[in-house]
């Protein structure tokens, strides 16, 4: 193979286009100048390189930038980066804003993979903070993104940026995140009528207080009860059984299937026997008739 | 996203013709070069010929020169490619390429 080390007679690459899909992999090796490469790299995504032939263009840049490319290379890498591995990514530093919505772009359609997910640390850590344009472009290429930020990151989060997230994109969320979610979204879908409201909402409703849910059940909304599973048990417990039947309507006959399952479970034992026989589903377990119900917890406030 | 999807492909006899398409849809072309590629049993792509959207530019590989026409139809979004002379070292699946999407394939087989 030494013979193909030197470049053949007027094949040295005089620029970055499409003539150098017909290289072979040592042709490119041998023709194709890094620094070159460095300065036109917004012309290969235009370009169909195979991947092996990516791969050769990709060992060019790194042996030109050993500790990591330059941000004016970075911006324009295309669909390159999608050859870039986490280590590679960890050398870089990126600053703007412009850099990340290209490469988020790229990765566009996709789940979030390894690169994405270090290129995304790397920015916040370069930029010190979460700021607002930050989370408005990761949010609007990325809305589970969300779910990974701790509840003191959430809180930076604008309103607007709530209308891009999907109900799957919540499902990763813990109670503590959807605490800090939930006002945002009540927020930013304060204007919409009851029943599209409702709709909006819904998926955000495990970090809703007892009194939001009070106001739901005035609404007929028929709330399932995969979402009812998934209230805050201490924003279930207050309310009443004609509360419950009114929020779950025709989806009331599901808590006879959850009955041992929080928050149904602690909901029925503070519940009177009575009020949840009026169920007519069975529900065991409610304070029988004639036991008076002390709040303890309210108690303990007053003293 | 680009979508492209090769039709065209077939058995034919040695010295015999196809022509391949391959119809866009999704984003604009304009700023994609486009070009057909091929794979042979046990061996690796290989680039056939290319076509800038924007200058009009074609470029052939050496081994089809004089045998195979790449064109276009910007008013369908398609790309073709005329095959014509084919032998059986044609044998390939070939594949249409627009920057970083690439279609499925269709497969291409010369023999008597």
């Known amino acids: 193979e030494v013979e193909k080390t030197a470049c053949p007679s007027g094949k040295k690459a005089r620029e970055i286009d499409e003539s150098l899909i017909f290289y072979k992999k040592w042709e490119l090796e041998a023709c194709v100048d890094a620094a070159l490469l460095a300065t036109q790299m917004d012309r290969v995504n235009a370009i169909p390189f195979t991947y092996e032939q990516l791969d050769v263009l990709k060992h060019k840049l790194d042996e030109l930038y050993p500790q990591g490319y330059p941000e004016s290379v970075i911006q324009h890498l295309g669909y390159l980066f999608l050859k870039m591995s986490p280590e590679d990514i960890r050398k870089w530093n990126v600053t703007s804003l412009e850099t990340l919505k290209a490469l988020l772009e790229v990765n566009k359609g996709h789940e979030m993979s390894p690169q994405v997910a270090t290129l995304i640390d790397r920015f916040v850590k370069g930029r010190g903070q979460l700021d607002k344009d930050t989370l408005d472009t990761l949010t609007a290429f990325y809305p589970g993104y969300l779910c990974s930020l701790s509840p003191e990151e959430l809180s930076s989060v604008p309103p607007s940026s709530i209308w891009a997230v999907r109900p799957q994109d919540l499902d990763t969320c813990d109670p503590r995140q959807l605490d800090v979610l939930y006002p945002k979204a009540r927020l930013a879908f304060q204007n919409m009528n009851g029943s599209e409201y409702f709709v909006k909402i819904q998926s955000f409703l495990g970090g809703a207080p007892t009194e939001d849910l009070k106001a739901l059940s005035q609404q007929n909304v028929s709330m399932d009860l995969a979402t009812f599973m998934k209230l805050r048990t201490d924003a279930v417990l207050p309310l009443t059984v004609a509360e419950v039947q009114k929020l779950l309507g025709p989806h009331v006959e599901g808590l006879k299937a959850e009955e041992r399952h929080r928050p149904v479970r602690d909901w029925i034992l503070r519940q009177r026997q009575d009020d949840l026989d009026t169920l007519g589903l069975g529900l065991q377990g409610g304070i029988p008739n004639g036991y008076l119900v002390l709040d303890l917890s309210m108690q303990e406030a007053l003293s | 996203q680009v979508q492209l999807v090769e039709s065209g492909g077939g058995l034919v006899q040695p010295g015999g013709s196809l022509r391949l398409s391959c119809a866009a849809s999704?984003?604009?072309?304009?700023?994609?070069?486009m070009a057909w590629f091929r794979q042979a049993p046990g061996k690796g792509l290989e680039a056939v010929a290319s076509?800038?959207?924007?200058?009009?530019?074609?470029i052939y590989a050496d081994f089809v020169k004089g045998r195979f026409t790449i064109s276009r139809d910007n008013s369908k979004n398609t790309l073709y490619l005329q095959m014509n002379s084919l032998r059986p070292e044609d044998t390939a699946v070939y594949y249409c390429?627009?920057?970083?999407?690439w279609g499925q394939g269709t497969q291409v087989t010369v023999s008597s």
């Open positions: 390429a627009a920057g970083r999407y």
């Open positions: 999704g984003r604009t072309l304009e700023s994609y070069v």
């Open positions: 076509i800038n959207w924007s200058s009009g530019r074609l």
